[in-house]
């Protein structure tokens, strides 16, 4: 805590310029005012503050505002904003992308801090949703902004919100996101022709099920290994040989580097050895030729 | 007054780990913002990641995201630094400093750490 | 990131001397930039911190100015202890860079 003390004659701050930088912490406190403070806050980020002197001034600003800064200090806090407690910052209500942006600036190529995730919390819960233009806000400042997300939290994306997310957006999402996501982008997606769609779809496709793989492996789309490697498991188990074939076209070549890994290897599991013969790819571990399949899962349906 | 005491350098293989610690003394460690700077054999400077006072906000030089890791105690008025991975570019002296922003206005005497075969 | 260069990188003068170092930053930097004293085995010591300030406790013979690009570090008479190496390093966008030195010799 500041202590309350005089300000030297001659030194009453009439604007916020570099000669405050010279300033002692108590000559700041005595001699700015908190009102011309707040209304001259984006010279401030210009001007090189120590981090003791931020100090005072945020100090100036939390009295002058016990209920949270108003839009209009926030649009320019600048570097001051890593000052700032994610306490703080729940008293805020940001409601314009170009104050989030502001502040996004300021801590960009860096992770995000606990300030950041409080900020983008606030903004988006004031908005209600995580429109198009926030997410691609957010996914250009981080770009695992997405993937950081509860599957809930996904819930409320609306499907127009998806052509803002880039393939490297979801990179680090795990299956249950991409069950959240993949569904909206299908919708999203859904009036494209076939290799456009393919294209966009890609990336979303480890939350897809087995029947939309089915239909895909009848458009040509030649699926390239890496992305049949992030397929969902369970969606991977019923498709037969030929679809498989259809579906990677000249990339099933690449099945013979991957049959140790999931979810080849347990396709290949399930799949006749005669079958996985007539690709010619050598791959082994197939069901041999006379035995019987039982579809378990079927049969416990069933009972 | 002021003082800074770093140690924990040494020679260390390609891949393997260091953890440095800074000891201050003579200010308000919790009050203050801390940085590692290292010098290499070519005597120029070079930041690599400083931490805010109460350890909340924590940035890297891009060089070592990922695999250095910076760390604080204010009650036992130390600063860490935990290298793993390290390569021969990280060899240099490793020197704490207090970060007041607009400068580091004091450092420690550094502590040597050689990356080598 | 910004790149900071000095020159020159080494100068010889004689005590008493006028000295000049020059710091140019690779884009505008304001006024936050800071200078540095180093001695051999010695850890790095502030002089000078937002372009013109003289750090507490360094003497008066030393003196910054500048903002932008281009920064000036003055040593106005030399004295036997300030022959080491110099550098300036900016603060206005991260990471924080330094310049590569500039050694002051005995002439």
């Known amino acids: 805590e500041v202590e309350k003390t005089a300000c030297p004659s001659g030194k009453k701050a009439r604007e916020i310029d570099e000669s405050l930088i010279f300033y002692k912490k108590w000559e700041l406190e005595a001699c700015v005012d908190a009102a011309l403070l707040a209304t001259q806050m984006d010279r401030v980020n210009a001007i090189p503050f120590t981090y003791e002197q931020l100090d005072v001034l945020k100090h100036k600003l939390d009295e002058l505002y016990p209920q949270g800064y108003p839009e209009s200090v926030i649009q320019h806090l600048g570097y001051l904003f890593l000052k700032m407690s994610p306490e703080d910052i729940r008293k805020w209500n940001v409601t314009s992308l170009e104050t989030l942006k502001a502040l996004l600036e300021v801590n960009k190529g860096h992770e995000m801090s606990p300030q950041v995730a409080t900020l983008i919390d606030r903004f988006v819960k004031g908005r209600g949703q995580l429109d198009k233009d926030t997410l691609d806000t957010l996914t250009a400042f981080y770009p695992g902004y997405l993937c950081s997300l509860s599957p809930e939290e996904l819930s409320s994306v609306p499907p127009s919100s998806i052509w803002a997310v880039r393939p490297q957006d979801l990179d680090t999402c795990d299956p249950r996101q991409l069950d959240v996501l993949y569904p909206k982008a299908r919708l999203a997606f859904q009036n494209m022709n076939g290799s456009e769609y393919f294209v966009k779809i890609q990336s979303f496709l480890g939350g897809a099920p087995t029947e939309d793989l089915k239909a895909l492996s009848q458009q040509n789309v030649s699926m390239d290994l890496a992305t049949f490697m992030k397929l969902r498991t369970d969606a991977v188990l019923p498709l037969t040989v030929a679809e498989v074939q259809k579906l990677l076209g000249p990339h099933v070549e690449g099945l013979k580097a991957e049959e140790r890994h999931r979810p080849v290897r347990d396709w290949i599991l399930r799949q006749r050895q005669d079958d996985l013969d007539t690709l010619g790819l050598g791959l082994q571990g197939g069901i041999p030729n006379g035995y019987l399949v039982l579809d378990l899962s079927m049969q416990e349906a069933l009972s | 007054q002021v003082q800074l005491v770093e140690s924990g350098g040494g020679l260390v293989k390609p891949g393997g780990s260091l953890r440095l610690s800074c000891a201050a003394s003579?200010?308000?460690?919790?009050?203050?913002?801390m940085s590692w700077i290292r010098q290499t054999p070519g005597k120029c400077l070079e930041w690599v990641s400083y931490?805010?006072?109460?350890?909340?906000?924590?940035y890297y030089v891009d060089s070592v995201k990922g695999r250095f890791t910076i760390s604080r105690d204010n009650a036992k008025n130390s600063l860490y630094l935990q290298m793993n991975s390290l390569r021969a570019e990280d060899t240099a002296v490793y020197y704490c400093?207090?970060?007041?922003?607009?400068?580091?206005?004091?450092w420690g005497q550094g502590t040597l750490v050689t990356v080598s075969s | 990131e910004i790149q900071m260069t000095q020159s020159p990188s080494s100068v010889s003068a004689s005590v008493g001397d006028r000295v000049t170092i020059t710091c140019r930053a690779s884009?505008?930097?304001?006024?936050?930039l800071a200078w540095y004293q180093q001695k051999p085995g010695k850890a790095p010591k502030l002089l000078i911190y937002?372009?013109?300030g003289l750090q507490s406790g360094v003497p008066s013979r030393f003196s910054g100015s500048g903002s932008g690009t281009d920064f000036t570090l003055t040593i106005s008479s030399l004295q036997p202890e300030d022959f080491a190496t110099y550098y300036c390093?900016?603060?206005?966008?991260?990471?924080?860079?330094f310049g590569c030195g500039t050694k002051v010799e005995i002439k």
């Open positions: 400093a207090r970060d007041v922003r607009t400068a580091f206005d004091y």
């Open positions: 390093q900016q603060a206005n966008s991260f990471p924080p860079t």
């Open positions: 931490i805010s006072s109460s350890g909340s906000t924590i």
């Open positions: 003579g200010f308000t460690f919790s009050d203050h913002y």
């Open positions: 937002a372009a013109s």
């Open positions: 884009q505008g930097i304001s006024s936050w």
